[in-house]
């Protein structure tokens, strides 16, 4: 129950990629506003997105303080223009989010192939180490900085003339693969956190092929 015309938020959903984290909910407000609070399991509640008519709240700044913590958020509903008004129990209506552990649950963003270089029958493929919004000592950490060896990359590579995708794996950001001389190859990479049970894989990077500007060929 609550004051007339005020409904509790529902379908609270975490949307998170590379630790950029937004809480979304329903419904679109009619004569009401929302405030969000976030807390770790053992911490105090912190209010964000005060009296907003949005149905989302960016909580990145809070969760990046410790991405291995488990967070809980709640969304309060207030009548528009009367935010002091409370429900019949003397408190505003609110709904809890599911728990969220960024390190285990943030989606892996689409990776990018930074470069590839062919030397004879070897090709070195380098994956861009994407910057996250996680900070340490006032600098933004890369995905590799945050996940360390928990993060691997799968390289798919294939001859331009064929469809079968060979694979290689690395726990760094570089691959060194054997290729057939005189053949053009295409590449795509996927970020993976094998230790996870959900959100283990990223979407595939854009395909890059030999003969395009990212690559370099050296005959030796």
């Amino acid at each position: 129950s609550g004051t007339t015309n005020t409904v509790a938020a529902y379908n609270l959903t975490w949307k998170s990629t590379n630790f950029k984290t937004i809480l979304e909910w329903e419904p679109k407000p009619v004569n009401q506003v929302y405030t969000v609070q976030i807390s770790t399991k053992s911490g105090d509640w912190k209010s964000k997105c005060f009296y907003t008519t949005d149905t989302e709240c960016d909580l990145t700044d809070e969760i990046v303080k410790d991405v291995k913590q488990t967070y809980l958020a709640r969304v309060f509903s207030y009548p528009a223009g009367n935010v002091e008004s409370t429900g019949s129990a003397g408190e505003p209506l609110y709904e809890n989010s599911p728990e969220f552990t960024p390190y285990l649950e943030t989606n892996l963003g689409q990776p990018t192939i930074q470069s590839f270089e062919q030397v004879g029958t070897k090709v070195n493929v380098t994956v861009e180490d994407e910057r996250t919004l996680v900070r340490r000592n006032n600098t933004f950490l890369s995905l590799r900085d945050v996940f360390g060896k928990d993060l691997i990359y799968t390289l798919y590579y294939w001859k331009s003339s064929s469809s079968g995708k060979k694979t290689a794996k690395t726990n760094t950001n570089e691959f060194l693969i054997d290729v057939d001389k005189g053949e053009n190859y295409c590449f795509s990479v996927q970020a993976v956190i094998p230790s996870r049970t959900v959100n283990r894989k990223s979407t595939d990077s854009p395909v890059e092929c030999m003969g395009q500007e990212k690559g370099e060929f050296r005959e030796i």
């Epitope: 799968t154 798919y156 995708k165 060979k166 290689a168 693969i177 996927q190 094998p194 049970t197 959900v198």
Partner: antibody
Framework: EVQLVESGGGLVQPGGSLRLSCAAS????????IHWVRQAPGKGLEWVGY????????YYADSVKGRFTISADTSKNTAYLQMNSLRAEDTAVYYC?????????????WGQGTLVTVSS | DIQMTQSPSSLSASVGDRVTITCRAS??????VAWYQQKPGKAPKLLIY???FLYSGVPSRFSGSRSGTDFTLTISSLQPEDFATYYC?????????FGQGTKVEIK
Amino acid sequence: EVQLVESGGGLVQPGGSLRLSCAASGFTISQYWIHWVRQAPGKGLEWVGYIDPYNGYTYYADSVKGRFTISADTSKNTAYLQMNSLRAEDTAVYYCARDYGSWRIRLDYWGQGTLVTVSS
Amino acid sequence: DIQMTQSPSSLSASVGDRVTITCRASQDVNTAVAWYQQKPGKAPKLLIYSASFLYSGVPSRFSGSRSGTDFTLTISSLQPEDFATYYCQQHYTTPPTFGQGTKVEIK
């Protein structure tokens, strides 16, 4: 509990077709890779091919290329091996296996296998 | 394709014996080698991954090692349940390839 169950094996004539299924439970196939491995009677293990159900990428052993097709239905959490133009030398127990996908660990769970016999 | 040459193809041993099986890769495969145990009528089971790491639930009498392109599976004290066929496999490149297998029989 992670489980893989193959089905669809049987007796087929040379030149015929058969479709094997690999039903997974205890994990979501789109988050892993699925391989097919076969073993002819009294022989060793031979890798057949793999699929990444997340993007549909596949690769096949030369011995089956152009005849076998691996696919996956993520809504059914099942992978398939479509075998066409079968030959006597394709007679084997066919296993599907989960690829954990790490740099270190690969085929960590296997199904019990299904026997395919190609004979006239 | 990378060839994995496994030896011996079979061996006879007694309970309590130390058993060594080797696999040689035809080119560098880093540590991307696994060892599997297979019993008649059953699927292979992962024993060792990344050349020397014991898979969860596998008894500590099993161990693996690497020296360049040579890989070794050792059973320190053979138990009755260890009589089986053992396979090495490289997963450094596609296609992954298996050794021919080593059958460990009772002497």
